[in-house]
């Protein structure tokens, strides 16, 4: 159920319309639900979730990660810098979410929902951002070649890549959720 359409909202007609912050928060929680379902399938299918060989595959990936310099941590918190980092990071994750699309059997729809919901989240955040010029959009050609490279990996590496994408995306969203609630 997309955010804003759950039974809780229906049952409370007196409730004020969701604020921008609440809508964003709800959207992130919805995506995290999707990631949780995808991680379940990944962990059931392989032993990647307990693997200690993650570093081998992580070298091939350049997954977005929050660092102190991004302005999203309490120490040195900067709303605008942080917002730019969140949007840029989500845009960078899009190619990895595209990679996930053919990686699931029973959760195929869930993978699509995570991808589409992330696009909606980016739109919400872009409306909130003042400095859209600072947001760098990934180069489509670079993304296309990265996608080809990822899809050409052997089965073990593809499983590991799937696991790492989900884990990193979850962490990035949680860091974003935390920072956005301080704005």
């Amino acid at each position: 159920v997309p955010p804003g359409e759950d039974s809780k909202d229906v049952a409370a007609p007196h409730r004020q319309p969701l604020t921008s912050s609440e809508r964003i928060d709800k959207q992130i929680r919805y995506i995290l639900d999707g990631i949780s379902a995808l991680r379940k399938e990944t962990c059931n299918k392989s032993n990647m979730c307990e693997s200690s060989k993650e570093a081998l595959a992580e070298n091939n990936l350049n997954l977005p990660k929050m660092a102190e310099k991004d302005g999203c941590f309490q120490s040195g918190f900067n709303e605008e810098t942080c917002l730019v980092k969140i949007i840029t990071g989500l845009l960078e994750f899009e190619v990895y979410l595209e990679y996930l699309q053919n990686r699931f059997e029973s959760s195929e729809e869930q993978a699509r929902a995570v991808q589409m919901s992330t696009k909606v989240l980016i739109q919400f955040l872009q409306k909130k951002a003042k400095n859209l010029d600072a947001i760098t959009t990934p180069d489509p050609t670079t993304n296309a070649s990265l996608l080809t490279k990822l899809q050409a990996q052997n089965q073990w590496l593809q499983d590991m890549t799937t696991h790492l994408i989900l884990r990193s995306f979850k962490e990035f969203l949680q860091s974003s959720l935390r920072a956005l609630r301080q704005m």
């Epitope: 929680r29 995290l32 884990r167 979850k170 935390r178």
Partner: antibody
Framework: QVTLKESGPTLVKPTQTLTLTCSFS??????????VGWVRQPPGKALEWLAF???????YYSPSLESRLTITKDTSKNQVVLTMTNMDPVDTATYYC??????????????WGQGTLVT | DIQMTQSPSSLSAFVGDGVTMTCWAS??????LNWYHQRPGEAPELLVF???NLQIGVPSRFRGSGSETYFTLTINSLQPEDSGTYFC?????????FGGGTKLEI
Amino acid sequence: QVTLKESGPTLVKPTQTLTLTCSFSGFSLSTSGVGVGWVRQPPGKALEWLAFIWWDDDKYYSPSLESRLTITKDTSKNQVVLTMTNMDPVDTATYYCARSADDYLYYSFDTWGQGTLVT
Amino acid sequence: DIQMTQSPSSLSAFVGDGVTMTCWASQSINDYLNWYHQRPGEAPELLVFAASNLQIGVPSRFRGSGSETYFTLTINSLQPEDSGTYFCQNGWSFPLTFGGGTKLEI
């Protein structure tokens, strides 16, 4: 099974620095979404949140005590340390460490230590 | 900072009764409200998180509800072990803040 245990001095002189250690087991402070916080409770009074540290080392402090507090973690030792400078008799309280761990960051403390009374 | 106010500060009831206590936030905290129970000499225990979700192991006679700024905790069919103090907590943003507590005497 998740457990947390506070340790440190029970008696501190005014102006001294209090150092409390929270030793935990049953979870890792390198897992995303996981954090450890400190909460105190003066005798017969309400709970007061002091500090919080996240899996990624992001730290939060109570604004009224921020200048006196430092929170750090040692992931390999499964420990979180809180230091509080310039102690005063009004800081007499039971100090608790507690864990927060959920995907949506509800900032809820699902497991608490037994607490340590500092006078 | 978000201020949390609890009412009443104390109440007494009999075994088998039902009681409701309230918690107000000084600004909207969405559904990020947590409830704790503390018995004398013990550490607090999480009862309800995110306004209405019962923590694992908490009896179904406890029920949390509310959103934005107004929240309630209802306990049906009171048991002797329910005595103690109940605290609400803002879980929306830092600094984390607790209410002053509601002391329940059975």
